[in-house]
Each structure stands twice: as structure tokens, then as C-alpha cells.
Interface confidence: medium
Amino acid sequence: MMTGTIETTGNISAEKGGSIILQCHLSSTTAQVTQVNWEQQDQLLAICNADLGWHISPSFKDRVAPGPGLGLTLQSLTVNDTGEYFCIYHTYPDGTYTGRIFLEVLESSVAEHGARFQIP
């Protein structure tokens, strides 16, 4: 029986040119996480495999950074990044858990808002 629950950042907003963290957390289960997939609609953004580590899809590698934790950082946001994002936890023996985040990217009102940052 699948007893786990996924907590996510829910509905979030950010401004064009800025950066954002997508974050999920799986709780209430003793299942072992074997892999986490991050997807945007039907596109694969990144994979974090328990044994192999992170893989960022080549088409996103300039704008996507792994972490913090099992989360994903999106940079240089555009209005086209608006939409649904999914964290898909592959676990054993439970199976698959999916969390949903809706991101709205807003037109920037102040140019300096497009601040960049780094994940150490």
C-alpha cells in the first residue's frame, strides 16, 4: 500500500529573467527513493538517480541547475516557462509518487529584478 505523501512548493510566481527553485519532499513512507524525475508537461528536465547522480537534459543544461536537495533551480526565466512542473519519485517497493507545481512567470516590472544566484 502506498502511504507516502509529496509536499511541494505549490503554485508559485517569479518574474521574467529571474530564477526559481522547484522543490518537493516525499514523507510518510519508508520506501527507498531510487530516482526523481523533473518534468515540464511532457518534457524531461532532469533526473536525479540514487546511484548515478544528476542528469540535466541537454536542451535545458544552460538554464537548469540541480538542487537544493532533490529540488531543481530554473534560471533566466521566460514567459514560456509558465506551466505545470512535476516531480516524479520512483520508489521501492511503493512505486511512483508525483507532485505538481504550477509556475507563473510574470513580465518584469523592474530590470534589476532579474538577479542571478548560485547553489554552492
Epitope: T8, I12, A14, S19, Q23, A115
Partner: nanobody, 114 residues
Framework: EVQLVESGGGLVQPGGSLRLSCAAS????????MGWFRQAPGKEREWVAS???????WYADSVKGRFTISADNSKNTAYLQMNSLKPEDTAVYYC????????WGQGTLVTVSS
């Protein structure tokens, strides 16, 4: 528009402690995510810690075991308890709410020096 007001910074000796607060107000989604970043002179802004509304926390390796992040979502406020401070923790500290890092607040300056 979202407004973020950080407070609690100051001058502290190495090994000392500070507690930073961040109050968020205005029109924002209530996703329940809050985070702290910092920017040292001449360096890029870097992530320090994050908390989800359920109490789940993440920390940069450089602060793990010394800093504790928490949030009171009913008050739209985040906190960063900083213990065993080091000179390399000197920076302007910023908070952010709901995963979106814009707009930034003014930040609060933490100086660790003897």
C-alpha cells in the same frame, strides 16, 4: 506587489549567534516555501537554506549544523538562526518567499569580526 523585509543583522564576534527575520507581505501565492540567500562583497548571491511549509529543510554544506531555518506561515515570516558564526559568514542576507526570487528585499547585513 510582494514586499520582503529582512531584519536582525548586525556585528557579532566569531562563534557568536544572530537570529534573522523576514516578513513577507503583499500579493503573492501561498506556496509555503521560504528561503535565505546571502551575498558577500564581490561575490555572487548564493543559496543558504530553504524550508517548506511542512517543516522540511535544506541547507548549503557551508552552514549545515550551524544554521537553522524555520517559517511561521500564518505570519508570512521566515527565520534564520545562525550559531557558531565565522568571518566567512559575513554578507548581506536576503530572504525569498514561494520559490520566486524576485523582487529581492533590501537584505540585512551580518558582519562577523573580532
Amino acid at each position: 506587489e510582494v514586499q520582503l523585509v529582512e531584519s536582525g543583522g548586525g556585528l557579532v564576534q566569531p562563534g557568536g549567534s544572530l537570529r534573522l527575520s523576514c516578513a513577507a507581505s503583499g500579493n503573492t501565492f501561498s506556496g509555503g516555501f521560504m528561503g535565505w540567500f546571502r551575498q558577500a562583497p564581490g561575490k555572487e548571491r548564493e543559496w543558504v537554506a530553504s524550508v517548506l511549509r511542512g517543516g522540511y529543510t535544506w541547507y548549503a554544506d557551508s552552514v549545515k549544523g550551524r544554521f537553522t531555518i524555520s517559517a511561521d506561515n500564518s505570519k508570512n515570516t521566515a527565520y534564520l538562526q545562525m550559531n557558531s558564526l565565522k568571518p566567512e559568514d559575513t554578507a548581506v542576507y536576503y530572504c525569498t518567499r514561494d520559490g520566486g526570487f524576485d523582487p529581492w528585499g533590501q537584505g540585512t547585513l551580518v558582519t562577523v569580526s573580532s
